[in-house]
């Protein structure tokens, strides 16, 4: 019908506004994995900006895989309508203001700003140049406008965005909107080794964040998590060379709050940073 046609026109148009998602895995391509099962699953398509069906093989793959359309929408579309209305009308901080400072796993040394929920202020930190999370602003002003409370204790409303009702996307109206295609979410480098559910005994490596080294483990052949590498070199390249090595070189800036656990977040950025 005409409504479908209208929506199709919008989602295939290259003038779609910048998009910001909570989880990086929403940007991953659907990955059916190497196994041969035929399982109906859903993934978020960053280009159509919709959750779509795909056939999953039953093992491996990536995190952009959901059992239901509802789960996919919940994880990847951010319920933009409700969130923005809440943010702009009720003066609440966006969720990402409460994320911990996260330098990412690359080895740049870029000054950025994050909102420190303990001090209730925006503070400077050193960003590695890739990955990280949404609590990451290019300027102090931008951080303050989005995350700090105003003089009366209200959130300063500087989102400067309008909701596009047709495709539930945000149209930028000012420079307050962070850059295009920054995707943010959990990484796997700090998750424990997970054998998975099958019965194979494959030699794999996982990153042990406690000792800061890649260690071998036996993988069952299916399931598990993404802290799972076929070679030690691959494991080191993905987890150690960026994040842990930067810590050992004193690359992180100290903040006033205690950090229970350094969480690595994956983020596809519209910026490209080479692994040096």
């Amino acid at each position: 019908d005409s409504e479908e046609d209208e929506e199709h026109t919008i989602i295939t148009d290259t003038e779609l506004p910048p998009l910001k998602l909570m989880h990086s895995f929403c940007a991953f391509k659907a990955d059916d994995g190497p196994c041969k099962a035929i399982m109906k699953r859903f993934f978020f398509n960053i280009f159509t900006r919709q959750c779509e069906e795909f056939i999953y093989g039953g093992c491996e793959g990536n995190q952009n895989r959901f059992e239901s359309l509802e789960e996919c929408k919940k994880m990847c579309t951010r319920d933009n309508a409700n969130r923005i209305i809440k943010t702009t009308l009720q003066q609440e901080k966006p969720d990402f203001c409460f994320l911990e400072e996260d330098p990412g796993i690359c080895r740049g040394y870029i000054t950025r700003y994050f909102y420190n929920n303990q001090t209730k202020q925006c503070e400077r930190f050193k960003y590695g140049g890739c990955l990280g999370n949404m609590n990451n602003f290019e300027t102090l002003e931008e951080c303050k406008n989005i995350c700090e409370d105003g003089p009366n204790g209200f959130q300063v409303d500087n989102y400067g965005t309008q909701l596009n009702a047709v495709n539930n996307s945000l149209t930028p109206q000012s420079t307050k909107v962070p850059s295009l295609f920054e995707f943010h979410g959990p990484s796997w480098c700090l998750t424990p080794a997970d054998r998975g559910l099958c019965r194979a005994n494959e030699n794999r490596f996982y990153y042990n964040s406690v000792i800061g080294k890649c260690r071998p483990f036996k993988y069952s052949g299916c399931g598990g998590n993404e802290n799972n590498f076929t070679s030690k070199q691959e494991c080191l390249r993905a987890c150690k060379k960026g994040f842990i090595q930067r810590i050992s070189k004193g690359g992180l800036i100290k903040t006033k709050r205690k950090r229970k656990k350094q969480r690595v977040k994956i983020a596809y950025e519209e910026i490209f940073v080479k692994n040096m």
């Epitope: 391509k29 960053i46 290019e138 300027t139 596809y268």
Partner: antibody
Framework: QVQLVESGGGLVQPGGSLRLSCAAS????????MHWVRQAPGKGLEWVSN????????NYADSVKGRFTISRDNSKNTLYLQMNSLRAEDTAVYYC???????????WGQGTLVTVSS | DIELTQPASVSVAPGQTARISCSGD??????AHWYQQKPGQAPVLVIY???NRPSGIPERFSGSNSGNTATLTISGTQAEDEADYYC??????????FGGGTKLTVL
Amino acid sequence: QVQLVESGGGLVQPGGSLRLSCAASGFTFSSYGMHWVRQAPGKGLEWVSNISYMGSNTNYADSVKGRFTISRDNSKNTLYLQMNSLRAEDTAVYYCARGLFPGYFDYWGQGTLVTVSS
Amino acid sequence: DIELTQPASVSVAPGQTARISCSGDNLRSKYAHWYQQKPGQAPVLVIYGDNNRPSGIPERFSGSNSGNTATLTISGTQAEDEADYYCSAYAMGSSPVFGGGTKLTVL
């Protein structure tokens, strides 16, 4: 309608400098990452550099690192590429392009020719 | 960086189907994009995200990506489709990369 117009190209001697500009219109310039891509005569496309939406993060191809500097002025809706220590192999048409998802450039300028020759 | 390989040239008769390949290590795990460039002109995006067509691009252009190869397909090729075609992709932590380009000749 989105428009990107490059300028500043020309003939320069090896070791010389040039500054390219790209004037943007028809979209919210300050919300988009921008890129320079070049094409040597008769050759393929080569990504050169990019800059984040507010200008604080930049990246370069190995072939130009340390010699080229990308910048932007959001108040003027303009992207720049300062090219120093130019070499013969930098001879190319330089395009500015609007960046979307990595590797995906949805709008391109018509290009400006830079010729490095003695 | 990922390396993308394209055939230097492809020829097709008018009205026939042209297929241009772009191969790279595990390319299926990355999004592939395609650009058309006519002599003396800037590149134009014709396919993005493997198989999405920007507005204004004719329906005869389509794309696919599986295994190590992305393919641009032009059904019912017309004389005006004669051009150079470039694929591009991006591998996490590196730079955007273009294939070497394919010259499409409409016989």
